[in-house]
């Protein structure tokens, strides 16, 4: 099934092309699909989903995360400010889907879809938010040494940050797509 | 208390012009998709327009695209619906509803209405 | 503009459950989970009572529930009372950021 297409979604071949909010929403749920795959590996191989230690590994990440200032959230809802904070945050976590990639064994497909699936997304976004003030993108330096930082954990260290970044990659996503819905 | 007020509405002739207002209150109207929805006598309802909760995108029923235009003035709590080049076929009650929060195309407060009608 | 399809009218005695069908295409009932159900009580504007398919929106009765198959939608009405003698109507999202309602179903309660 091809991203942003979800199976039980597939339409008869005659239906028009799907409008940019269309394809938004696809793109989102079919990465979703993906992130709830990987999860599933990552619970299975290891205890990280149930362990209480997640806020050791919390604090030396710095994962992208919706806050009251983002406009994204019910109260407080800006539409221009919130499509830039999911563009920025969906950029900011592109270093830490790279990471992802040799962390899987059964799912090495999945997490190289939920990658360049999220990256098609964010070019959805930028098209949508063509008026938009520039949106600022991660300095390539730096990814690169965190990068390096994150791959150079232990191995509890790793497992903790691949289950951290695949919970709040659902719960960014999960709220983008909410607030989405009402642009 | 969730209210939703419109008016504008009047007898006009074919080709004329006119502008509803909705005046929202009791919520966050900047966090809100709206649209608008009518009635024609005796009919069922018909979706027009929607307008994102910033007014960054609209989207029009193939029935008005050209004609209508949706707008909002969210520092006034307020939704538009410029109506030009009205027909006969345009003659129904016009809701003001709010999309649910987070839930895609679903209505979940609706004004009282305001009738058009469009005769010569 | 399209329209969904729904029996003009149904009715039920009290106490007993009628259900209303949505018929759709691929396009819209059959495209995803956006299907909702309007109550309209005579001379007054529509009222929310189901979305995403089959949740009930806040305050309605657990008489009122809705399902999808396919391309066709149901409300169900259990244990009728007068006060649901109404028109009812289902709308769905319809490909190309549109929203299709059906013709509305009038719904009499005997007895």
């Known amino acids: 099934v091809p991203p942003g297409e979800d199976s039980k979604d597939v339409a008869a071949p005659h239906r028009q092309p799907l409008t940019s909010s269309e394809r938004i929403d696809k793109q989102i749920r079919y990465i979703l699909d993906g992130i709830s795959a990987l999860r599933k590996e990552t619970c299975n191989k290891s205890n990280m989903c149930e362990s209480s230690k997640e806020a050791l590994a919390e604090n030396n990440l710095n994962l992208p995360k919706m806050a009251e200032k983002d406009g994204c959230f019910q109260s407080g809802f800006n539409e221009e400010t919130c499509l830039v904070k999911i563009i920025t945050g969906l950029l900011e976590f592109e270093v830490y889907l790279e990471y992802l990639q040799n962390r899987f064994e059964s799912s090495e497909e999945q997490a190289r879809a939920v990658q360049m699936s999220t990256k098609v997304l964010i070019q959805f976004l930028q098209k949508k938010a063509k008026n938009l003030d520039a949106i600022t993108t991660p300095d390539p330096t730096t990814n690169a040494s965190l990068l390096t930082k994150l791959q150079a954990q232990n191995q509890w260290l790793q497992d903790m940050t691949t289950h951290l970044i695949l919970r709040s990659f659902k719960e960014f996503l999960q709220s983008s797509l909410r607030a989405l819905r009402q642009m | 208390e969730v209210q939703l007020v419109e008016s504008g509405g009047g007898l006009v002739q074919p080709g004329g012009s006119l502008r509803l207002s909705c005046a929202a209150s009791?919520?966050?109207?900047?966090?809100?998709?709206m649209s608008w929805v009518r009635q024609a006598p005796g009919k069922g309802l018909e979706w027009v327009s929607r307008i994102s909760s910033g007014g960054i995108s609209t989207y029009y029923a193939d029935s008005v695209k050209g004609r209508f235009t949706i707008s909002r003035d969210n520092a006034k709590n307020t939704l538009y619906l410029q109506m030009n080049s009205l027909k006969p076929e345009d003659t129904a009650v016009y809701y003001c509803?709010?999309?649910?929060?987070?839930?895609?195309?679903?209505?979940?407060?609706w004004g009282q209405g305001t009738q058009v009608t469009v005769s010569s | 503009n399209f329209m969904l399809t729904q029996p003009p009218s149904v009715s039920g005695s009290p106490g007993k459950t009628v259900t209303i069908s949505c018929a759709g295409t691929s396009s819209d009932v059959g495209y995803g989970n956006y299907v909702s159900w309007y109550q309209q009580l005579p001379g007054t504007a529509p009222k929310l009572l189901i979305y995403?398919?089959?949740k009930r929106a806040s305050g309605i009765t657990d008489r009122f529930s809705g399902s999808k198959s396919g391309n066709t939608a149901s409300l169900t009405i259990s244990g009728l009372q007068s006060e649901d003698e109404a028109d009812y109507y289902c709308a769905s999202y319809r490909t190309g950021d549109n929203a299709a309602f059906g013709g509305g179903t009038k719904l009499t309660v005997l007895g």
């Open positions: 009791g919520f966050t109207f900047s966090s809100y998709a």
């Open positions: 509803v709010r999309y649910a929060w987070g839930v895609q195309w679903a209505f979940d407060f």
């Open positions: 995403n398919v089959n």
